[in-house]
């Protein structure tokens, strides 16, 4: 298992919500990506392929997510101060072998300007 801070901008704020970007190498074909808040699994997305190369995408803990060829974005809405925490992208690589797990993360700071419904 490889642990480290994300070497890219992991948090993108918009409209009172945040997009949490979890990147993976282009070469990875099949994987599970989990978004952890502290030690708790908030969201996950699994991409696998069958023997006919058909892609299956599953979520056991569903969040609004978006898949590209080198990242999974998880979206959290209605931000408040309780969202401030360490968030980790837990990547399990199934393909190509060997099986590998990597953990990258960062701290989500919540500022008044990013909250969805500020009191005037």
């Amino acid at each position: 298992e490889i642990n480290g801070s994300a070497n890219y901008e992991m948090f993108i704020f918009h409209n009172g919500g945040v997009q949490i970007l979890c990147k993976y190498p282009d070469i990875v074909q099949q994987f599970k990506m989990q978004l952890l808040k502290g030690g708790q699994i908030l969201c996950d997305l699994t991409k696998t392929k069958g023997s006919g190369n058909t892609v299956s995408i599953k979520s056991l803990k569903f969040c609004h997510s978006q898949l590209s060829n080198n990242s999974v974005s998880f979206f959290l809405y209605n931000l408040d101060h309780s969202h401030a925490n360490y968030y980790f992208c837990n990547l399990s690589i199934f393909d190509p072998p060997p099986f590998k797990v990597t953990l990258t993360g960062g701290y989500l700071h919540i500022y008044e300007s990013q909250l969805c419904c500020q009191l005037k």
């Epitope: 699994t46 696998t48 069958g50 190369n53 299956s56 393909d95 190509p96």
Partner: antibody, heavy 117, light 111 residues
Framework: EVQLVESGGGLVKPGGSLKLSCAAS????????MDWVRQAPGKGLEWVGN????????EYSPFVKGRFTISRDNVKNILYLQMNSVKSEDTATYYC??????????WGQGTLVTVSS | DIVMTQSPSSLAVSPGDRVTINCKSS??????????LTWYQQKTGQAPKLLIF???TRHTGVPDRFMGSGSGTDFTLTINSFQTEDLGDYYC?????????FGPGTKLELR
Amino acid sequence: EVQLVESGGGLVKPGGSLKLSCAASGFTFSDYWMDWVRQAPGKGLEWVGNIDEDGSITEYSPFVKGRFTISRDNVKNILYLQMNSVKSEDTATYYCTRWGRFAFDSWGQGTLVTVSS
Amino acid sequence: DIVMTQSPSSLAVSPGDRVTINCKSSQSLLSGSFHYLTWYQQKTGQAPKLLIFYASTRHTGVPDRFMGSGSGTDFTLTINSFQTEDLGDYYCHHHYNAPPTFGPGTKLELR
């Protein structure tokens, strides 16, 4: 240790039906696509079809499409092959296989299906 | 559908021989960085066993005398120093698209 054990084979008349089962153990069944592969006596291997982890996707060989149905029970860890309208050319040993992400990495011992009147 | 062909269909071999089995696909099996080509061994009365995946990667526990090579549409399984326990049928297989198909097989027999 991964184990796949097929059952349900036997003699069936042309046009008849048969349901094969494959009991899986030694791995997290619900994490894997599963396939059926068959082998006619003295012949080569032929893919029958597959099913994804939760049963929402199935694919079939053109030779069996519309006649065979693959399903799974992730609570009991069992893979099924429902064979309807069978033909003599369906006579074969049927193998249950685990699709280990990039190859069939585990196979059952096979169960023989004979279609004959 | 992709058609897989193999040559020879059978081969008489002796212990210590270098054995070469060829497999040809009707279209390229290259997807991204990998060739979606697999080799299986089947001994008489047994289920097939995985030998090589992604054209050249040996499966866990497969002796290093088994080697896979090739690219595009042409692939080779080589057994360096054939042993009697290697007798059986060998199949290539693609998973480039649906339906995945097997080659017709190559039977290794004792000379």
